[in-house]
Structures are given as C-alpha cells and as structure tokens.
Interface confidence: low
C-alpha cells in the first residue's frame, strides 16, 4: 500500500499557502483528486509529488494515491481543506443526474471543518426541502439525498453558518429520472367486438408510463387512425387515451384494430377483432358426441357452447323422456362465460339412475330466435341372467334370458358336480350361442336376449350354467337338476351394480 506524506488523514491550510503532497510506493504511483487549478506534478519512479504554491478554496478535496501494479489494488488518501473565510463551499459539479431510488450526492465540499456543525441543505431562494427528504452530510463529500424521488428534481444550495449568517454555495441542479421498466403498458377495450350493421360502437386504446415521453396510436388493418388524444396523470403514471366512436357501423369498419405505444425502451402492441354482422345470431355446439353412452351409476356432464350476439334472453335444460316427467334440477345446471360472446352451459348428471336415460335438450333464446341442441343418453348395464327349465315341442329345454346394454353375449357351460359357478377344472362342455333371440330392443332400454339349450336328458350330478357378458360386466345363473325337479341358483351378488 502506498504511503502519503504528510502522514495525516486531513490537512487544513489557508488560501495562498504552499502545499506539498508526496506519495511513495513499491512501484510507480499515481495521484487522483478533484479537478482544480495550480497543481504541479513531479514523478520519479516509485514516488510522486503533488504541489501548489498558491492554494485556493478550489483545491479543497480528497487526494488519493494508488499503485497500479499492486494486485491488491491498495490506495492511500488525504483530505485537504483550504480554509477561505469568504468561500465556505467548493462545488465540484453543478448538475447531478440519478435514477429514482438511487442515492444522489450533491458534491459541495466544506472548505473549513470547523463549520460542519452549522451546515444545512436548502432549495434555491431559501425554500425548505420537501417533506420526507432524507439526507446526510459528509464534510469530505457533501450532501447525500437518500433514495431520491422524481419529485425531488430541484435546484439545491449548501448552506454554512459563518459569524452568525448563512453563506450559500452556488446552486446544484438535481435531476431524478424515472426508472422506465419497459415500453408503456397498454389496454385495448373491448378485447373482441361484435355489432349489427347500423349499431354504435366504441374502441378505446390507452397507454400509460412513469415517463411522459411516449407515443400511442390506434390502427385499423395497418392504417393509422387520426384520433384526438386525451392525456392525464394519476397514480404517478402518465396516461394517453385514444377513443374511437362509431355512430353507425358498417362492414368497412370490421377488421383488426391494433393499439401501439412506444418509448425509449421499445414498443408494445395489442390487437382486437371487430366483427360486423348483418343480423343477430345464435349458434349452439358441443365438443361431445350428441349420442352418449354411460354405465349406470356413473356421472356425466353435458356441455353446450353458445356463441351469440346480442346476449341471451333465456336458456334452460329440458328432459324430453321417455321415462318420466322429471326435469333437471337447476342446481345441477352451470353457466360459465368464456368471453363476451361465448358461453358454456353444463348439466351435471351424477350417479345416473335407469329413469334418467333419454333425451336432454338445451334451449337458448336471443333476438335472433330460439335454438336447441339435444343429447341422447343411453345407459349401459351389466347383464342380469335367469334360467328356467321347460319343454318346447316335447323336448326338454333350458331357457336363459339375459338383459343388459350393450346386448349381452351368451355362453352355456356344463360342468360336473353341483356348483354355484362352473370353474375351469369342472367344465365338461361349453356352447357359445352366436345368435340369441332378441326379445326386446327399445331405445334407451336394456336389450333382452333369450338363448335355448336343448337337453335330451338332464344329468343329475351336473350343473348347467348360462353366462352372459357385455362391455360393462358379466352375469351368470347356475341350473342344478335334482331328482325332485329342477333347481336354479342365481349368482351370489358377485356382479352387483347399482
């Protein structure tokens, strides 16, 4: 680290005095200090001498000696006061520029350390500082305004009390610049617009920024529109608003509108689409299939998307049968607005019961008329099976009835022993019935099929089982011939479904 002679942190001299500052280091050394007149510099290798024969108040300041070759970057400093009774302040700069929330140093250096107790900072013409101005003073550096605000952009003077009177420095202009985070913020209202030809419309483009220096314009299909601009300042932001009023819209007004704003940081733009239509419209659609199949006991949400202008005057869900005259509960119907002209309507059908199969219609109305969208809901059921023993045309026949949806397939099994259900080890024969007779097949109902197995003689130590299955599940019924007559076994609720 270089060494300064005289080896004192501060040196106080009178105007006209000779001052010699010597710096010695291991290698070459350099002086750094405030720009002031009358200094002479002598250097010889590892030492450097700064001297003046006629010190003035302008020589007041901190002089630093550095050793450029020192990897640790060490330095030494001495502060010189040139104590001029007529000049208590040495102002190093008359304009200071900072960004908001930075500390602003106003570099008025006190020429006499004795005066420190009576210093203050004022605005020019003796006006007091603004409220909430937080500042501190250092006789070596000057006044620091902490976390400067835009509103503190003013002309300041440093004041010192000398012989009972205040002596001012020359003025220092502080410019606090707003931190501009980016291009102006934009809003374009509405985000989408639909009007019938001849109706009125309004499009508002507004931009705001912390700084007043920005431009905003509205364009239609890439053509800049000449619209008077309204300006405002609130919430510490400058606002510029362009309002396009159309008394009677026509098709040439339709298209893309862009709101564009720019400043030094760049450009922002946002767009909307204006649609002009001949007359009111109402469109219903669904992303779902209009023919729905759901397993009994499960839930289903029916969703309808509505696009309409003007807005809806009425809407409701209706059950059209065929099972009962119940109507969907209002609490199960839900409406959500996606945007101004599009809505989604949902009907929730939790834990579907057999009587709830059928047609559900959504109806909506606006000045364009009524529209309806109808869903057909079929419930799926696992098969229910029963077997009886009968004689057909004199032949002993096992008759199996299976009902469910989708249509069940039927398989007959013959197995040894008396059992509720044939397992693989016991099976003697298996017959698939590829063409069971369909007994009933009405829309929204279960399909009932019948399968016949002609058995010339019933083997008494055997079980005949009818099994039916579909995509939902399976069901079975075991028939056990016993000497006192036939005996049947339903499944032990193994395939229970509500």
């Amino acid at each position: 680290i270089p060494v300064i002679e005289p080896s004192v942190p501060e040196l106080v001299v009178k105007p006209g005095a000779t001052v010699t500052l010597r710096c010695v280091g291991n290698g070459s050394v350099e002086w750094d200090g405030p720009p002031s007149p009358h200094w002479t510099l002598y250097s010889d290798g590892s030492s450097s001498i700064l001297s003046t024969n006629n010190a003035t108040f302008q020589n007041t300041g901190t002089y630093r000696c550095t050793e450029p070759g020192d990897p640790l970057g060490g330095s030494a400093a001495i502060h010189l006061y040139v104590k001029d009774p007529a000049r208590p302040w040495n102002v190093l700069a008359q304009e200071v520029v900072v960004f908001e929330d930075q500390d602003a140093l106003l570099p008025c250096l006190l020429t006499d350390p004795v005066l420190e107790a009576g210093v203050s900072l004022v605005r020019v013409r003796g006006r007091p500082l603004m409220r909430h101005t937080n500042y501190s003073f250092s006789p070596w550096h000057g006044f620091t305004i902490h976390r400067a605000k835009f509103i503190q952009s003013q002309d300041y003077q440093c004041s010192a009390l000398m012989g009972g009177r205040k002596v001012m420095s020359i003025s220092i202009r502080l410019k606090v610049q707003k931190v501009i985070p980016g291009p102006p913020a934009l809003t374009l209202v509405p985000a989408e617009l639909v009007r019938i030809r001849g109706e009125a419309a309004q499009i508002v483009c507004s931009a705001s920024s912390v700084d007043v220096n920005f431009d905003v314009f509205l364009q239609h299909n890439n053509t800049k529109l000449a619209i008077p601009q309204q300006s405002d300042f609130h919430n510490n932001r400058y606002q510029k608003v362009l309002t396009l009023n159309l008394d009677q819209v026509d098709f040439q007004h339709a298209g893309n509108y862009s709101c564009v704003a720019s400043n030094v940081q760049g450009k922002h733009s946002t767009s909307m689409f204006f649609r002009v239509v001949e007359s009111a419209y109402l469109n219903l659609s669904s992303e779902q299939n209009l023919i729905q199949e759901v397993t009994v006991g499960e839930g289903l949400n029916l969703k309808v998307m509505v696009e309409a202008y003007p807005g809806l005057q009425g809407f409701n869900w209706t059950y059209l049968g065929p099972f009962s005259d119940h109507q969907p509960e209002p609490k199960l119907a839900n409406a959500t607005t996606k945007d101004t002209y599009r809505h989604t309507f949902t009907l929730s059908l939790p834990r579907l019961k057999p009587s709830e199969a059928g047609r559900y219609s959504f109806l909506a109305r606006n000045p364009g008329g009524w529209r309806a969208l109808t869903f057909e809901l079929t419930l799926r059921y696992p098969p229910e099976v029963s077997v009886i023993w009968t004689f057909i045309n004199g032949s002993g026949t096992l008759l199996c009835a299976a009902s469910g949806y989708p249509q069940p397939n039927v398989t007959w099994l013959q197995c040894s022993g008396h059992t509720d259900r044939c397992d693989e080890a016991q099976v003697l024969q298996v017959w698939d019935d590829p063409y069971p007779e369909v007994l009933s097949q009405e829309p929204f109902h279960k399909v009932t099929v019948q399968s016949l197995l002609t058995v010339e003689t019933l083997e008494h130590n055997q079980t005949y089982e009818c099994r039916a299955h579909n995509s939902v599940g399976s069901g079975s019924w075991a028939f056990i011939p016993i000497s006192a007559g036939a005996h049947t076994h339903p499944p032990d609720e193994f395939l229970f479904t509500p």
Epitope: V294, T295, G297, E298, G299, G473, F496
Partner: antibody, heavy 117, light 110 residues
Framework: QVQLVQSGAEVKKPGASVKVSCKAS????????MHWVRQAPGQGLEWMGW????????YCAQKFQGRVTMTRDTSISTAYMELSRLRSDDTAVYYC??????????WGQGTLVTVSS | QSVLTQPPSASGTPGQRVTISCSGS????????VNWYQQLPGTAPKLLIY???QRPSGVPDRFSGSKSGTSASLAISGLQSEDEADYYC???????????FGGGTKLTVL
C-alpha cells in the same frame, strides 16, 4: 393370473401433486372397476373412489372431490390416480384394487407417498 | 372415526373359534352386502368374504361370514398362527355413495 403392479414410492412437498400408476395384467382390463384405497401409517383403510376403465367414468368420495383425478390408458391396461394440493396428512400407502362396484377382489402391492416439507 | 364399528382387537389360541363383529346402519349394512378383508403384516389387503358369506376360491372354509340387520360378523374356526392379521369389514353406503370400512380388528394368536 391377475396382477396389479403399482409405481414406486414418492416423497413430495406440501402443496405439490402426486400421480400413482397401476398396471393390470391377467384379465380384461375394461371388464372391472378399478378402485383406489389408501392407508395412513398405523391406520385403517379409506376408500377414495373408482374409475370404470371401459368408459373412463369416475366417482370419488366427497372428501377427495376437487383434489383427486382418476384416469386410465386402456392401450397399456394402466389406471392412474393423481392427488393434488398435498398435505402432511396425505402421507399413506395408496392401493389400487380391481373389483365390482362394492368390493375389491385383487389389490396392488401399494405405493407409499410421503408428504414432508 | 370409521363409519362401520369393529372391536380394535381380538385374540385366541390355536384351534379356537374367534368371532369379529361389525356394526353399521340402515344406509350401509342394512341395505347392502358386507365384505371382509384380511391384511397380513406388511402386505396389501386380500378379499376374504364377499356378499355377506361367499368365499373367493382359495380361501379356507375355516372363514365364514354372516349378516343380520345392520350388523355382520366374521367367524374363524380352528384358529392358526398364520391367521394373525388385521381384519376389515366393508360395505357400500347409499347415503355417502361410496365404500365404507370398519376401523379394523387386530387378531392375535396367543
């Protein structure tokens, strides 16, 4: 033979989500409901809900509504259960179980989900 | 607090007969069938009895189930050391629209 193989143990932070998988083999995946049941450490069994792999329809216990999502991929015979907004009291072993609506005849080996900050 | 009520523990000596009770209400056991599950230490539960009294294949006939009104019970005769496990009853509940379990009974073979 029927087998249900579940994904491995998970450690999650409160507020996160977990997704447990259950791969079925040895039977027709779409022919049976897949249920999810959980068991907190040292506690009893708690039913969460079911999915019908055939239709994709789901139903879950009121306690879990809005937090649990059950899905399936029939092409790989796999059911999934996702639980969101996890809390420390969701720490449990989560089981998938094949069955009919009211009971479960085959169970997965279980997946331990630990929720800890 | 479980919807179905079971005693927390039960015990017996090898060869003995042990019964575990399960009490519910009209919306569950009263109107639906009861199922029983066995959970051996450190393993997943296993279906023991379905539809009140039916045994899946592979379950020994030492295990039997019964139901009366809003209560059900599981009986294990000829108790063996490998029966030491937790036993859970379960049923569908019409008002909760879901499966409900008992709190479980820890069976100890002395």
């Amino acid at each position: 033979q029927v087998q249900l193989v579940q994904s491995g143990a998970e450690v999650k932070k409160p507020g996160a989500s977990v997704k447990v998988s259950c791969k079925a083999s040895g039977y027709t995946f779409t022919g049976y409901y897949m249920h999810w049941v959980r068991q907190a450490p040292g506690q009893g069994l708690e039913w969460m809900g079911w999915i019908n792999p055939n239709s994709g329809g789901t139903y879950c216990a009121q306690k879990f509504q809005g937090r649990v999502t059950m899905t399936r991929d029939t092409s790989i015979s796999t059911a999934y259960m996702e639980l969101s907004r996890l809390r420390s009291d969701d720490t449990a072993v989560y089981y998938c179980a094949r069955g009919r609506l009211t009971f479960f005849d085959y169970w997965g080996q279980g997946t331990l989900v630990t929720v800890s900050s | 607090q479980s919807v179905l009520t079971q005693p927390p523990s039960a015990s017996g000596t090898p060869g003995q007969r042990v019964t575990i009770s399960c009490s519910g209400s009209s919306s569950n056991i009263g109107s639906n069938t009861v199922n029983w599950y066995q959970q051996l230490p450190g393993t997943a539960p296993k279906l023991l009895i379905y539809s009140n009294n039916q045994r899946p294949s592979g379950v020994p006939d030492r295990f039997s189930g019964s139901k009366s009104g809003t209560s059900a019970s599981l009986a294990i005769s000829g108790l063996q050391s490998e029966d030491e496990a937790d036993y859970y009853c379960a049923a569908w509940d019409d008002s909760l629209n879901g499966v409900v379990f008992g709190g479980g009974t820890k069976l100890t073979v002395l």
